[in-house]
Amino acid sequence: LTCLGGFASPGPVPPSTALRELIEELVNITQNQKAPLCNGSMVWSINLTAGMYCAALESLINVSGCSAIEKTQRMLSGFCPHKVSAGQFSSLHVRDTKIEVAQFVKDLLLHLKKLFREGQFN
């Protein structure tokens, strides 16, 4: 993840295998969604900035009993240097805004895609 600062370089740099797998899991969730994801559970919105992986995990970890996002939760924990438990709060949360998990996942995916296109698409 520390490589993300380097995306303004002339040519693109593909993601690490772990980040590639996270993106693919988010794609799977968004494309294979039939019923409302996690029964329409709501989570805190986050600012998609430098510490977004921990913030995303802090938000999603409050959703329990939803097998569809368990893999995403595990993957995000691999990108977050500290242990995250339910009820934790980060300054990156937009504390007055809750959104559906499906929208949260879609926003995270779109942001990751933007990150990787930066410096390549003018």
């Epitope: 693109p12 593909p14 590639r20 895609k113 933007k114 390549q120 698409f121 003018n122």
Partner: antibody, heavy 119, light 107 residues
């Protein structure tokens, strides 16, 4: 099912321009980049460039910079590739293809558009 | 620019034989390499992605291997419909580049 349907064959004179269209269906258009690849008769495949339909951002192969313009119309889920100042060696089949992110594979392709440049 | 060199240019084999196609990159591209099949008059078709990942709907006789600079596409027990041109593609960095192709023809 995912489909990329391209416009029909074109015959152009040297110096002219051509604009090839690629209409996408069966998926959310802005979720995937559109890349253009060409193939001269009996030759291999050559990447021309790409466009991100969500932002309109483009990435072109240096070889075609200044001569090629890629655009999209999100309202009709259509991508366009315009090539200017055509030469005889631009005679080729032009393909559009979609990629989720540039490092992904080209998983769906258009049927191809033959552009013939001849005086 | 990453140059992909495919060899051999032509492979003459009989149905039932094994085909081994090589693709060499001019620099390390990890596993960001994809393989396509193209038949005359048709658009290319994706066979293998990320060097070794199979695609649903593609017969199991197609497999890929390799990482870094050296990659291989193997077709176990060639079927008549496998005679075609095969291309490798660099997905590591712009400009995206493709190898010159290997034509697998009937001996």
């Amino acid at each position: 099912q995912v489909q990329l349907v391209q416009s029909g064959a074109e015959v152009k004179k040297p110096g002219a321009s051509v604009k090839v269209s690629c209409k996408a269906s069966g998926y959310t258009f802005i979720d995937y980049e559109i890349h253009w690849v060409r193939q001269a008769p009996g030759q291999g495949l050559e990447w021309m460039g790409a466009i991100d339909p969500e932002t309109g951002g483009t990435a072109y192969n240096q070889k075609f910079k200044g001569r090629v313009t890629m655009t999209t119309d999100t309202s009709t889920s259509t991508a366009y590739m315009e090539l200017r100042s055509l030469r005889s060696d631009d005679t080729a089949v032009y393909y559009c293809t979609r990629i989720l992110l540039y490092y992904y594979p080209m998983d769906y392709w258009g049927q191809g558009t033959l552009v013939t440049v001849s005086s | 620019e990453i140059v992909l060199t495919q060899s051999p240019a032509t492979l003459s084999l009989s149905p039932g034989e094994r085909a081994t196609l090589s693709c060499r990159a001019s620099q390390n591209i990890s596993d960001y390499l994809h393989w396509y099949q193209q038949k005359p008059g048709q658009a290319p078709r994706l066979l293998i992605y990320y060097a070794s990942q199979s695609i649903s709907g593609i017969p199991a006789r197609f497999s890929g291997s390799g990482s870094g600079t050296d990659f291989t596409l193997t077709i176990n027990s060639l079927e008549p419909e496998d005679f075609a041109v095969y291309y490798c593609q660099n997905g590591h960095s712009f400009p995206l580049t493709l190898g010159g192709g290997t034509k697998v023809e009937i001996k």
